[in-house]
Interface confidence: low
Amino acid sequence: YTSTAQPCPYPMAPPNGHVSPVQAKYILKDSFSIFCETGYELLQGHLPLKSFTAVCQKDGSWDRPMPACSIVDCGPPDDLPSGRVEYITGPGVTTYKAVIQYSCEETFYTMKVNDGKYVCEADGFWTSSKGEKSLPVCEPVCGLSARTTGGRIYGGQKAKPGDFPWQVLILGGTTAAGALLYDNWVLTAAHAVYEQKHDASALDIRMGTLKRLSPHYTQAWSEAVFIHEGYTHDAGFDNDIALIKLNNKVVINSNITPICLPRKEAESFMRTDDIGTASGWGLTQRGFLARNLMYVDIPIVDHQKCTAAYEKPPYPRGSVTANMLCAGLESGGKDSCRGDSGGALVFLDSETERWFVGGIVSWGSMNCGEAGQYGVYTKVINYIPWIENIISDF
């Protein structure tokens, strides 16, 4: 008794798939595979398959049922911190070649990394036009202020809401100041936080307020303090710069906005007699810490003139270095003072219409605002690589 094996039914490819090899007929032990078009994946029921091959059995049936070629679905896109996502292809469409557009919250954030347009690719990942699978970044817009120009010289003015939204109050031993960078860093003076370098959590950081003693402020805490390696405590103020990393990002708004770092071209806005603005809660002419945030507009002083002013006793020779800049009036009366340390001396970049930090309040004569003496500030532009390296590494 003999029997001939039955040929198997001709395999019909699922939509968006094809059979290989194509044969006139398929008999015992013949096999075929299904391959899906780009953007489609093999599914058996609801389970994805890496590959599919069926073999013709003796009874004329295939050993496996035909799979489906199902369109790749990238799934709902991740939420973007300080941003939002919009479905471009259609409401909730997340399948192959669907397009979504990330955007950042207007006014206070701008998109970094790419243009925010992502496409659902065949690998099942939302992918940017540059090929990135990671989310874009909504970076805070820096240097926005309610003050539109540097203005003329006048001192001891009360700041208004939104004038200095980068201003940070640092408490922890002494009162000092800093300036917000991005949304989780504070730029300050090394001497202001030196004692806390090994105990960062002891720093009480406040922002978004004008009144030093107000209970209404945004609280931030320090995760780490980075003091410039070239700073030597109690041996002058060269390299008087530090960064504080906050343990959480702060929410940016009209009262809390980071200051910009200086561009390469920034020195053209910081020449002798150009006006910078210093702000803080430091000592006023009455000898007390200010209750309200104060600011003063002061001109940059010729570096040689400033060096000469601090060459005579009681100041040691070489007190003013190339890493410093000076600002103030020859006649005195307009200056930063104790308690202002670490705050930013800011300048308006008239090309970008953004404020940037040119100096950090560092040191000066014992008597603030003294005639013939000037406030000395850490020259931030000299430290851009140092700042950028720390921020990128941590």
Partner: antibody, heavy 120, light 113 residues
């Protein structure tokens, strides 16, 4: 509203190449496949292939591989089809059309057609 | 490739008459997983571009008059015009979109007597 505007008629010599354009307006250009269809008198409609603008994705009907080449410029929202080594067999009206979605390959939107005549 | 065959190639009818035209595919266009037939119908009037009438074999495109009806499943499909009007003078094409390459039928030329 969605519109596909094709370039004008072309009279070409045998052996030459021609490049037809299809400018899309009214929708996100890089999201939808652009199809190309040939129509010769008495021969009905033939699908040449498709391109997904903004990517390298193209699918060609085997019959037209080597004859047609698709490109797209997302800055101008324009798709192009180049036909090479023209013969009289290539004399036809060529349409661009837009697929409905990635999975739905029927064509709701069509260009007005470009007549290509190949004659010595 | 899937071959699409249409019949008749031409027919002439009077206004108000019912018309049916056929489209056959060389393999089934019914996909068992979703029970959908991957077939569309187009109308092409003289000097114009084709216009979509029907997709999924029987779903009318928005704006298409309800006198146009698509039916059929598997390999046999029909387009019916319940009451022909003068403006229906056109060539009607079927197209499958089951797998690459998409192919069209040869067309049915509808003439008005």
């Amino acid at each position: 509203q969605v519109q596909l505007q094709q370039s004008g008629a072309e009279l070409m010599k045998p052996g030459a190449s021609v490049k037809i354009s299809c400018k899309a307006t009214g929708y996100p250009f890089s999201t939808y496949w652009i199809e190309w269809v040939k129509q010769r008198p008495g021969h009905g409609l033939e699908w040449i292939g498709e391109i997904l603008p903004g990517s390298d994705n193209t699918n060609y009907n085997e019959k037209f591989k080597g004859k047609a080449t698709f490109t797209a410029d997302t800055s101008s929202n324009t798709a192009y089809m180049q036909l090479s080594s023209l013969t009289s067999e290539d004399s036809a009206v060529y349409y661009c059309a837009r697929r409905t979605t990635a999975t739905r390959a029927w064509f709701v939107y069509w260009g007005q057609g470009t007549l290509v005549t190949v004659s010595a | 490739d899937i071959v699409m065959s249409q019949s008749p190639s031409s027919l002439a009818v009077s206004v108000g008459e019912k018309v049916t035209m056929s489209c056959k595919s060389s393999q089934s266009l019914l996909y068992s997983s979703n029970q959908k037939n991957y077939l569309a119908w187009y109308q092409q009037k003289p000097g114009q571009s084709p216009k979509l009438l029907i997709y999924w074999a029987s779903t009318r495109e928005s704006g298409v008059p309800d006198r146009f009806t698509g039916s059929g499943s598997g390999t046999d499909f029909t387009l019916t015009i319940s009451s022909v009007r003068a403006e229906d003078l056109a060539v009607y094409y079927c197209q499958h979109y089951y797998t690459y390459p998409w192919t069209f039928g040869g067309g049915t030329n509808l003439e008005i007597k």
